[in-house]
Structures are given as C-alpha cells and as structure tokens.
Interface confidence: low
C-alpha cells in the first residue's frame, strides 16, 4: 500500500522537511504533488512526467519545493502557512490512479524566556508572590524549575494560567531559591535565566552563646548574640533591664558578683519591623557552687538505654572530675566524657551500672563533691530458676517449689502446671502429692516495667518406682592425656542413693577417679586408653533400685611409635620388599612411606618387586591421628645386597 | 602488645566449605566484639558480621545471614568464619578486627594480615 | 543501613601540598552529639591502618599531619603537607549502628 511518511513530523519554522513515499507501484506514467486532502488542480504543488523526466509546477508551487525521482517530495525554509496535508498523486502505465496522503506540524522557534515578578521583597509568611513566564507563546508548554528541580508538591505553590504563572502563597524563608521556567514546543525548549526570590524574614528568636550561665569571680564574660533575620538584624544588650550597647557581642572584663543578674539581647530587623528578644540569667560565684548531677534517664532499661549524667552548673575554665562507686572511672568502651568532663555517658547500661555516680568541681583550695547519685537501672528478669533441682519424689511427700529472676523491679510470679494457671506466688506448696501431681511445672516471671517475660519449665515426676536412670558426658571422645570426662547420672531424685559401675565392677580406687555431687558425678582425670570401659550408674532409693543402660568411653589415642614388620633389614637382590606398619591408635591412623625422604603411597603396606642394590636407604613410615592431631614415625634401613655375596641378617 | 593471627591462604573448588581463624594475643577476646570485613580484588571494604565472644551472639549483614558463620572459642582466644556454598563471588581477602574494649571509641585500630580465599575449579 | 558516599573517587596532589577528601553520610552517624565516623588508610596489600577515629582524634602513633573534621553527615579527612608514603586508598566508616558500613574509598596518587 502506497504511504506517505514525514520526516520530520513536527517541522521548525526555517527548517525542511521530506515528504519520504513508501511502496511506490513500478511502471509509472508520473505523479503529482497537492496540498490538502485531496487532489485539486487548484492546489497542484508540482507534477512529474517519468518518461520526459520533466517536473511542471502548480498553483501552489513556491519556489521551495524539489521533487525526487522516487515521487519524495522536500520542502525548504518551512514556513508557518505549510502546517497540514500533502496528497500524493500516483499516475500508472496502465493509467489507474493511486493515491496516499501525510502531513506535517510547522511550529515557530521558541524565543529565550524571561520571568517577571509582583513582589521583590515579599515577607514571610505575610505576603505571595506571582511569578509569570513571558512571553505568551501559543502551543507552547510552560515548566517551572526551583533550584534546577522540577517543583515539589506543595499546597502553598499553584500554578495557572496555563502554567504560565506560578504563585507562592505565605512565602517563607525556604523559598528562598533559584527559579526558572521552560517554554516547550515540539521543536524547542528553552529556559530563563535564573531569578533568585529574595524573602524578608525574622528576626527569630535571639540564641545567646556561650549557653554557660555560671562564672566564677574575676573571669572576662564575652555573651554573643545572634538571630536568623533577613536582612540581618541589628543587636541591643539590657543589663537588668538598662540599655547597655547597640553591638552584636557584650564584653565586660574581670566580673565580680555584682555582674549577677538578667541580660537581654534584643534584635530588630529593620525591613519586617518586628523586635524579638531573649534573657539569660548570668550567676557570677565567688567560689565555684557545691555541683550537682543531672540525667537525662532517670529509670534507663538494661542493654537498651544510654544514661548521660552532667555536672551542674556548668563554669568557664574548670576542671570537672568523676567518681563510681568512690573511685576514679575505670576504663570502659561504655564510659563516655565530653570533651570538657561535664557529661558522663554510660553506653548501653547493664545492671552493674548503679553507682553511686559522684562528680566534682575542681577550685583553687580543694574539690567540691556533689551527692551521690544512684542509677534505678531495669533489668531482667533473667531466666527463673526453680529449686530445689530434683525431678523426682515419691507419693506422700510435700512438694514444695520456690522461682527465683533477677530482675528490677522485683518480678511478679506466676505458676503453671501442665499449661494451666495455679497461683500468682514465688513459691508453690502442694501437700501430700500423688501419681496425679507428675507434669510439666512452669514458672513464669514478669518485670511490670520493662514488660519482659521469662519463663522455665521443670518436669516432675512422682513416682514410687525409680526411673531407669541414663549417664550424660560432657565429652563424647575425649583424648588420652589430655582430657577429662564427667559422667552425671541422671536425673536427679530427691533421698536416692547414687551408684556406679566400671565393666560390671565397683569402682577401683584411683586418684583420677572423682565422685562428687552426691555421687552423682564420676569424673576421670587424664584419661588413658585402659579408660575404655562399660560404664553403668545406679540409682536406689528405701522401696526401689535402678541400673542405666551401660556407656562405653571412647578415648582417642595414638598413633604410638609405629613397628614395621618383618624385622629383616638385609635382603638379597631379586627378592620382593613387603614391609607393613602398624601403629596403636584410636581412631585407625593415616598411614604413608618414605624411602630416603621421598614421598610414597598413603598404605599401611610397602611393597616393591624384585629389589636390586638402588633400592638400599632408609625407610620411613608416618602415622598421623586426625582426631587427636598427634603424629609418629619410625625408621628402617634397608640393605640389598647383589645375588651371590651371602647377606648377614640382621634385626 | 595486641596480635591477630589468622590462618594461611585457602584455595578452594566451588560449592565446597571453608572455615578461617583468627587468633588473639595481647587480650582476652570474652573483653571485646570480634568482627570480620570482606575485600574482593581491587575493591573496597565490606562488613560481614561480628561475634560478642563472651556470650556467642553473633550479628551479620542480610546478604551475609546463611553464607558465613562467626564463632568463638574463647579457651583458644581464636575467632572463626566459616563461609559455605563458595562461588566465585567469594574469592577475597578476609580480616579479622577487634572491636570495643581495647579500642578507643569503638574503632577499629588492629587488624589481623588478612587470609585469601580463592575460588576456583 | 547507612550509606557513606566517599569523594572524590581519585586524587592527584603534589608532594608538599594539602590533600582533602569527603565522607557523606546518608544519615547522622552522631551519638550524644559525636561522629562515630573513622579513618582507615589501606596500602596494597596490607590491611587497613587506623588514622583518625571519632571524627577528629588521632590515633597514637600517625603523624599529625592527618586531621579529621566534621558531624552529623558530613566529614573530612586532611592531609597537610602530602608526603610520597601517603599513597594509599583512604575509607571512612561508621559504627554509629549495624551494620557498620564503610564508604567506596579515595585514592590518593602524587602528580
């Protein structure tokens, strides 16, 4: 299908453009250009006869058109009036017409633009301003720009006038920015030079610097004053209510106790109007005051809260010390001071944080302490712990169980058997208990202020009959020499005897033998090889006895000093060497040769066919315990003798 | 005097395991926070995670949390990373850097020399 | 986590002159009105060395031709005057919280 494609489609006024004709049926008789729609002899452009190769203008012709043998057309120094359709008329050999039509938008370059203003010295938060983009320019887009960003959403920003205007209602001191606007069309964009709004504020409340309000006797007072204020404000001092001078800076040298009192710093902006002032209270001390501590944190929560103790009153020129727990601070990643020792800061408190905190001014004479000062840390609760620790009583008896968290405040207990909620109590008492009594006994603790809960669980179990008792270790593989195991027989009963069994026999006297914990506990020191046994515990009571199941000790050991074998160090030329190594060793070691200190196979066996004289040297076995990380060597010298001289064997 | 010893270079096929050591002298690790930093070659600095020995609670970075695991053993006075899974995006050098106690204000002013670890089939 | 934006990335400085480059925080690393913000100097190689903690005091030990400056979010390390064994890359870190970040690093080279 025959097309017609601009390029460009949006066409600046001074520019060209080509009319670019897709799919061009083949034997022509010519074509013709029209403007419009349609093709009207009144509004030929130009026609074009192949045969003659001979372009005829039209009525529309200006003098800026050129037609290409191809049937594109391109038009030069476009001008506003050429905006709209071109229609393409395609003239056959067979004289059937076809016809395609496109178009093209002219739009003018865009001139630099300019911003006017209705307000150059607008106050805040009193008057808006309008900024307006000029010049109007139709089809054209306008942008605004604050500080080379496109602007933020704001409500007191609107634009109108088809974005032509943008308002600033109640301006303030942060609109103080670079403005610029954009004008767009689809052939141009150019920006303004940047206007900066210049917004009248303040001025705000004078800050008086140093924040000091302690001096001693005989110091020079230097007060500063200072107020946001555009344009900058002008300063007067009051001295207890008398002007004293109209400068930014007070200076009195060599103050006395009479220089006490109220002193006001007043500034004035002389374009708003407005007046605004601040008092601060100075006390000159003959001597430095008895200090005093300040926290920001007066309940801080353990691991999570910082404390910052300052020492009041803060003087010019002193030196401030500390003291916890009436010593000198100790060093510490959690104990900070500022750099003039007024402010102590204890990082992440924990509970051992308490104090008492102690600070103290240094004068000429001696060390003013201020009082002690205690910190009310919250902490916990911990984990509960329940006792006594037995897991097993007999019907009859009274169980009587008592939880215990640290915690400040003191925790809040609660008991729960099987799930089910007893008594808000530390202790839990219940008489004369039975086989029903046996369940899971929770303590749950509560620090009503840091609203942490801990609980713990205990399993009881009554019982006439004893259980079958079990052995725990606290080292599955111990190694030989090294090492020591302890076997705990559990669980622990309440008025049971404990017993314990090596290979089926009562225990041998042995100074590495230890029982401890009620015989609960059987520990053996520096274990050996020969410690590898059935080790059985037993528990007994006045009606029954019990026997756990037995726990062999695996000790690790070795590698000793290897043996090769056969013991033969002379052979004769032609026999085969078959040397094997054994180590005593648990667990089995790694194994490797080395003839004459060259590296051979990793086997516990050497073999070597047929051996001549080269294979004379010294032969050296490695055994290597990965588990106990200990290694040994032996090694052999091996002679070979040439068949015929006669070997004298030797061990 | 403060010393970090960390264990030797490392040269390792991918998808396997490795596991680096740091050993202290000159303080007691249970005093301080152990920590470990990444720095792949000709690259910059990258924090991995740290270990309080005294307790072993340990703290990682997100894209860390199942790739390295800090421990401690504070009987050895030697800190641990174990990298697992290794790809090539984990061939780096490793470092290891106390933290706290005998550092002024939570700093970090020793280093061990660093291991490399080389990922490669 | 907070990022820590380090520049320039490079730096050319003659022997003698001042070199001066920037850590930008993304948030305040301050606690208790401190930049918990420090200096590291790394030679290839080697592992990093501690020039500067807390944003201004000198470790023991480094010259005091190093300096740091700053709070909050912006920072400063200075170097004044260069020496040819300055040549090192240079990175700042926070351990305001974790994770503890460190910036991309400044090289520093001599014209």
């Known amino acids: 299908k025959l097309t017609i494609e601009s390029t460009p489609f949006n066409v600046a006024e001074g520019k060209e453009v080509l009319l670019l004709v897709h799919n061009l049926p083949q034997h022509l008789f010519g074509y013709s250009w029209y403007k419009g729609e349609r093709v009207d002899g009144n509004r030929q452009i130009i026609g074009y006869v192949i045969g003659t190769q001979q372009a005829t203008p039209g009525p529309a012709y200006s003098g800026r058109e050129i037609i290409y043998p191809n049937a594109s057309l391109l038009i030069q120094n476009i001008i506003q009036n050429d905006t709209g359709f071109y229609t393409l008329h395609v003239i056959k050999s067979d004289l059937v017409n076809e016809e395609a039509t496109g178009q093209f938008r002219v739009y003018p370059e865009l001139p630099k633009p300019s911003i006017s203003s209705n307000n150059s010295k607008p106050v805040e938060d009193k008057d808006a301003v309008a900024f307006t983009c000029e010049p109007e320019t139709q089809d054209a887009t306008y942008l605004w720009w604050v500080n080379n960003q496109s602007l933020p959403v704001s409500p007191r920003l609107q634009l109108s006038n088809g974005n032509r205007t943008l308002t600033l209602f109640n301006v303030t001191r942060n609109d103080t920015a670079s403005y610029k606007c954009e004008t767009q069309n689809p052939v141009s964009a150019r920006r303004s030079d940047s206007v900066i709004l210049n917004v009248l504020y303040g001025p705000d409340a004078p800050t008086i610097s140093p924040l000091n309000t302690s001096y001693r006797s005989g110091e020079n007072l230097n007060l500063s004053c200072h107020a946001a204020s555009n344009p900058p404000a002008q300063y007067s001092w009051f001295v207890n209510g008398t002007f004293q001078q109209s400068t930014q800076e007070l200076f009195i040298p060599n103050i006395t106790v009479n220089n006490s009192g109220s002193y006001t710093c007043q500034a004035h902006n002389s374009d708003t109007g407005l007046n605004r002032t601040t008092v601060t209270t100075i006390t000159v001390y003959a001597e430095p005051p008895k200090p005093f501590i300040t926290s920001n944190n007066s309940n801080p929560v353990e691991d999570e809260d910082a404390v910052a103790l300052t020492c009041e009153p803060e003087i010019q020129n002193t030196t401030y010390l500390w003291w916890v727990n009436n010593q000198s601070l100790p060093v510490s990643p959690r104990l900070q001071l500022s750099n003039d020792n007024r402010t102590l800061t204890l990082l992440s408190v924990t509970r051992n944080d308490v104090g008492p905190y102690e600070c103290g001014i240094q004068n000429k004479l001696s060390v003013d302490h201020s009082d002690p000062v205690i910190l009310n840390v919250l902490y916990g609760p911990d984990d509960p712990t329940i006792s006594p620790s037995y897991t097993y009583y007999r019907p009859g008896v009274n169980l009587s169980l008592s939880c215990h968290a640290a915690s400040n405040p003191p925790a809040q207990y609660s008991w729960l058997i099987d799930g089910n909620i007893q008594q808000h109590t530390q202790e839990l008492f219940i008489s004369n208990i039975t086989e029903k009594n046996s369940g899971l006994y929770t303590c749950q603790a509560n620090n009503s202020a840091s609203g942490h809960s801990r609980t713990t669980v205990k399993t009881i179990t009554v019982s006439a009959e004893l259980p079958k008792p079990s052995i725990s270790s606290n080292n599955s593989k111990p190694v030989e020499d090294k090492d020591a195991v302890a076997f705990t027989c559990e669980p622990e009963a309440q008025n049971t005897t404990y017993l314990w069994w090596v290979n089926g026999q009562s225990l041998p006297v042995s100074p590495r033998l230890q029982l401890s914990n009620g015989n609960r506990t059987l520990t053996l020191f520096n274990v050996t090889r020969n410690d590898a046994r059935a080790y059985v515990c037993g528990i007994q009571n006045s009606v029954s006895a019990n026997r756990s199941d037995p726990v062999t000790l695996d000790v690790l050991y070795g590698p000793d000093t290897p043996i090769i074998s056969p013991p033969d160090s002379s052979y004769l030329s032609g026999a085969n060497l078959n040397l094997s190594c054994h180590s005593a060793s648990n667990p089995s070691p790694q194994y490797s040769w080395r003839i004459n200190g060259i590296p051979q196979q990793h086997t516990q066996v050497l073999f070597i066919a047929k051996i001549t004289p080269n294979n004379n040297g010294t032969y050296a076995c490695f055994v290597s315990n990965l588990a106990t990380g200990r290694n040994n060597s032996i090694v052999k010298s091996i002679t070979v003798s040439a068949s015929g001289t006669s070997p004298g064997l030797s061990a | 005097e403060v010393q970090l010893q960390q264990s030797g270079a490392e040269l390792v096929e991918p998808g396997a395991s490795v596991k680096l050591s740091c050993t202290a002298s000159?303080?007691?690790?249970?005093?301080?926070?152990m920590h470990w930093v990444k720095q792949r070659p000709e690259q910059g600095l990258e924090w991995i995670g740290r270990i309080d020995p005294a307790n072993g609670n340990s703290k990682y970075v997100p894209k860390f949390q199942g790739k390295a695991t800090i421990t401690a053993d504070t009987s050895s006075n030697t800190a641990y990373l174990q990298l697992t899974s290794l790809t090539s995006e984990d061939t780096a050098v490793y470092y290891c850097a106390p933290f706290g106690y005998y550092v002024s204000d939570y700093a970090m002013a020793y280093w061990g020399q660093g291991t490399s670890v080389t990922v490669s089939s | 986590d907070i990022v820590l934006t380090q520049s320039p990335a490079s730096l050319a400085v003659s022997l003698g002159q001042r070199a001066t480059m920037s850590c930008r925080a993304g948030e305040s690393v301050d606690i208790f009105g401190v930049g918990f913000l420090h200096w590291y100097q790394q030679k290839p190689g080697q592992p990093p060395k501690l020039l500067i903690y807390r944003a201004s005091n000198l470790e023991s030990g480094i010259p005091v031709r190093f300096s740091g400056t700053g709070s909050r979010t912006d920072f400063t390390l200075i170097i004044d005057p260069v020496e040819a064994d300055d040549v090192a890359t240079y990175y700042c870190?926070?351990?305001?919280?974790?994770?503890?970040?460190f910036g991309g690093g400044t090289k520093l080279e001599i014209k």
């Open positions: 870190q926070q351990t305001n919280e974790d994770p503890y970040t």
């Open positions: 000159g303080f007691n690790i249970k005093d301080t926070y």
